[in-house]
Amino acid sequence: MPACCSCSDVFQYETNKVTRIQSMNYGTIKWFFHVIIFSYVCFALVSDKLYQRKEPVISSVHTKVKGIAEVKEEIVENGVKKLVHSVFDTADYTFPLQGNSFFVMTNFLKTEGQEQRLCPEYPTRRTLCSSDRGCKKGWMDPQSKGIQTGRCVVYEGNQKTCEVSAWCPIEAVEEAPRPALLNSAENFTVLIKNNIDFPGHNYTTRNILPGLNITCTFHKTQNPQCPIFRLGDIFRETGDNFSDVAIQGGIMGIEIYWDCNLDRWFHHCRPKYSFRRLDDKTTNVSLYPGYNFRYAKYYKENNVEKRTLIKVFGIRFDILVFGTGGKFDIIQLVVYIGSTLSYFGLAAVFIDFLIDTYSSNCCRSHIYPWCKCCQPCVVNEYYYRKKCESIVEPKPTLKYVSFVDESHIRMVNQQLLGRSLQDVKGQEVPRPAMDFTDLSRLPLALHDTPPIPGQPEEIQLLRKEATPRSRDSPVWCQCGSCLPSQLPESHRCLEELCCRKKPGACITTSELFRKLVLSRHVLQFLLLYQEPLLALDVDSTNSRLRHCAYRCYATWRFGSQDMADFAILPSCCRWRIRKEFPKSEGQYSGFKSPY
């Protein structure tokens, strides 16, 4: 169906109808949830400053390393070992690095007097040879130091290696000196200058404030704002031994964390320093542990270019600056409050879950009969009935049946397939509670109603024999007042229904049936109640009264309006009403599904 839109459709508002349950238990649960949720929401709002707009830090870093080291080197000169003392200053042990890093040399290996010529490789598994066949002219092994000439030559004694064109003599494959040559670098200090900016908040600051004592040294508790760090202390903080790391080298992270509250009333913006070892200290020898690189010092001797190759081991310090700056922002506050409102619905979800669980068939049939302490929970069935309105899908097969000798109503939602409706078991449905408010509108009609036999004469004249005369009750009849159906064979089983399940008195003999269903006075009152100016000819009046009587019976016996729409009247009642308000000619159509 196409949606039609009018002006009145636009100016509408829908809201939910709610059920308020006056219950100490559920009231307590509701407030418990609300208090817990409200407390958490407020705690999170304040502790995480969720009312602030946060912005990441933008930073620049500058470092200065200070310290002097005395190095005792063991060198071989003319086959004699000698101990050489030398002093290393900042220019000797630091190297310019890109980005937020600085490097401090802690150990080294020197290969002096190298020049470009042919010479044998240093003996290794890959370079040792027994004949020229083990060497290949032009071969460049990634692990090699030169280009092979294809010759296998004597290196020393009976050791032969492949000859290469390279910087000779070839650098020896040897371990880094132990202890580290610049072990005293542990006492070097580094000054870190860090400028930060939060452009969105138009705020700039730095880690070195005016009036800082420049002779200080950082200490985690005693001097946490000092920007001068002793290298040994940094390693102690991470649980590493500087002397051990100094041998092979390593990578250390200096973390500067800025957590800035830029609100005027709680302003705070100072850095927190922490340290983290960044290289893998468990790496095995084959995967090159530590941190090292090679560099060369070039010079000329007798017009021949030579170099001193130095394999440098040391510690690279990476300065990692991160953090956020936050300032109060009404939009962030509103967004946060909005995102937390849904949590307050948890109480309703939980209570609804309890009501639904405790009112389930499982609880009713398996738990309540055996568990005495669970008995108070039966009240949830009442809450559930008030809260939920169950609607059965109005299929063409849906029918409701009410027997006068049964407390419940039967719902039949299946095709009869030739079986009498009387014999179909169906599903038991609780009878709705009687609502007496409608009856209270009929005091005039129910008091002093004239006896039915004395009906106006003109109606009597119309009663042609439309009803069957046979007094032989059908087999399915239990009250003795039912008559066979006039419907075709295929639809007949729908009317094969008695007012009783077991033999006994017919409901049509009750005084109330006469007063509620057959009283012309009452039925006319009801018709006029609906249409005050109703004026009909005799035949249509009879039809109106008959259908009103059907409706009265259905409402009386089934209570619920929904059930009454699908109610099947017993044969005895149907024929008693038809007898009272007959059709002038033709057959009665029988029950028709309203949908």
């Epitope: 598994r125 040879c129 027994s130 066949r133 083990g134 290949k136 071969w139 092994d141 692990q143």
Partner: nanobody, 129 residues
């Protein structure tokens, strides 16, 4: 580490055939270049045949065309099929392994005993009538 065990040695007549087998322990067998070497009494250890982890082979000059090396990575074995055996083939045959995890052994160096880190105990082959 890899442990190597040679088997299949014994006495054979000249012109006969013999199949040696080298069984290796270790899950990373497929990353090793495998070689066969032999040592006759009073002589230097001599290269016989080798096969790299990716399947390329090399043979000693004296055995080319007579010996065949192969490998079965599923069984961790390296068989050496020896045909047309001669009396000068009499020696103790050793199986050897070279780790290629960090870099393949170049083909021209498969014959170099220095490349091989792990060695078996050897199996004696005697070619005599």
């Amino acid at each position: 580490d890899v442990q190597l065990v040679e088997s299949g040695g014994g006495l054979v007549q000249p012109g006969g055939s013999l199949r040696l087998s080298c069984a290796a322990s270790g899950r990373t067998f497929r990353h090793y270049a495998m070689g066969w070497f032999r040592q006759a009494p009073g002589k230097e250890r001599e290269f016989v045949a080798a096969i790299s982890s990716y399947g390329s082979t090399d043979y000693g000059d004296s055995v080319k065309g007579r010996f065949t090396i192969s490998r079965d990575n599923s069984k961790n074995t390296v068989p050496l099929q020896m045909n047309s055996l001669r009396p000068e083939d009499t020696a103790v045959y050793y199986c050897a392994a070279a780790d290629e995890t960090l870099g393949a052994v170049p083909n021209f160096r498969l014959h170099e005993k220095y490349e091989y880190e792990y060695w078996g105990q050897g199996t004696l082959v005697t070619v005599s009538s």
